[in-house]
Amino acid sequence: DVNEAPQFSQHVFQAKVSEDVAIGTKVGNVTAKDPEGLDISYSLRGDTRGWLKIDHVTGEIFSVAPLDREAGSPYRVQVVATEVGGSSLSSVSEFHLILMDVNDNPPRLAKDYTGLFFCHPLSAPGSLIFEATDDDQHLFRGPHFTFSLGSGSLQNDWEVSKINGTHARLSTRHTEFEEREYVVLIRINDGGRPPLEGIVSLPVTFCSCVEGSCFRPAGHKHHHHHH
């Protein structure tokens, strides 16, 4: 009669929870049985993010830290079942925690928009296009961002118009701008549940141009035209 290791009821245990569950929430459980009828002690292996704790007696798994889908889902850890009261034989199974997205990331600019410029003086109103993104999951359809100016005082000089769910156009309302940098605040709303807003800044320089680039005295880098 050879002593056998515990046997898990499944090779892979899978559970699904919202990424915003409270710390201490039960997120799943695993079960193993020992062929000799001995009790089992459960432990986790590979919990690199430190998110989980297993009850070593019952096999119930609880969250011990905030979960974040954007860090990667599913979150995979190993579960070890060790025979209690005998030779300490053990078996290993997998626990996969699928994290359901919560709208918890505000919109932001999709790339670095430093270096935007218009040649001064403007001969006609100008415009430039920018793109927004966020780190939440958008199933079946892309993001549906809406765009507006970040403060009322900007409305005399600028207007923002939506192109599609991710892109918008920033346009000047007139041509009477000084030769300097203007910081234009844009409010981006993701329309999610709950809706999250990000206020981003687009720095736009009005400068004298030489061959289509901003002219700067020696020692300054050229700005490149983005519109």
Epitope: L38, D39, I40, S43, H56, V57, T58, T82, V84, G85
Partner: antibody, heavy 120, light 108 residues
Framework: QVQLQQSGAELVKPGASVRMSCKSS????????IHWVRQTPGQGLEWIGA????????SYNQKFRGKVTLTADKSSSTAYMQLNSLTSEDSAVYYC?????????????WGQGTTVTVSS | DIVLTQSPAIMSASLGERVTMTCTAS???????LHWYQQKPGSSPKLWIY???NLASGVPARFSGSGSGTSYSLTISSMAAEDAATYYC?????????FGSGTKLEIK
């Protein structure tokens, strides 16, 4: 025969810590879970946590997480419980108990209890 | 947490009388993980019945246990003087394991 011998009564001041012991004999200490349970007139029997001396695995009642630390010393077959930041509500009789090695999870042997009184 | 409600809280019985006390769980508990303990004043609890119906070593045969799901009971077929004590039910299906508030059995 199986015995769990607990340390003596403790009188401690609020805010202090206390460490109590539970010495096992008559069985293989590393092969059974040791549980800690407290008893108060108001709350009855409350499970605090458990440790498996074989590998140090432990589990805590969420209510006591941060308040309690469970350890086990294989060489002396002794389990320890440290209670921190004591208040008058922690005045109670604290029991250690052995969990049967069978899959019932029953606690088949209990220590005689350690009485903790928190008072200034 | 699974809440165990014991009734009655206090009861008295004459010697030789049949006694039944109940334990109701707030959610279903596997019968393997439902246990009863006896405690007398000044003493620690003793395992009395494990896995719903199995008598612990040294427990007299007049004791029995039964139940399933959310409803469990402990019965003494013929009350004896030494049975006067407090009886606690206990579940360890889910963590944290929980205890009932006890039924105190007195001699009438």
């Amino acid at each position: 025969q199986v015995q769990l011998q607990q340390s003596g009564a403790e009188l401690v001041k609020p805010g202090a810590s206390v460490r109590m012991s539970c010495k096992s004999s008559g069985y293989t200490f590393t092969s059974y879970n040791i549980h800690w349970v407290r008893q108060t007139p108001g709350q009855g029997l409350e499970w605090i946590g458990a440790i498996y001396p074989g590998n140090g695995d432990n589990s805590y009642n969420q209510k006591f997480r941060g308040k309690v630390t469970l350890t086990a010393d294989k060489s002396s077959s002794t389990a320890y419980m440290q209670l921190n930041s004591l208040t008058s509500e922690d005045s109670a009789v604290y029991y250690c108990a052995r969990q049967t090695a069978r899959t019932t999870r029953a606690m088949d042997y209990w220590g005689q209890g350690t009485t903790v009184t928190v008072s200034s | 947490d699974i809440v165990l409600t014991q009734s009655p809280a206090i009861m008295s019985a004459s010697l030789g009388e049949r006694v039944t006390m109940t334990c109701t769980a707030s959610s279903s508990v596997s019968s393997s993980y439902l246990h009863w303990y006896q405690q007398k004043p000044g003493s620690s609890p003793k395992l009395w019945i494990y896995s719903t119906s199995n008598l612990a070593s040294g427990v007299p045969a007049r004791f029995s246990g039964s139940g399933s799901g959310t409803s469990y009971s402990l019965t003494i077929s013929s009350m004896a003087a030494e049975d006067a004590a407090t009886y606690y039910c206990h579940q360890y299906l889910r963590s944290p394991p929980t205890f009932g508030s006890g039924t105190k059995l007195e001699i009438k």
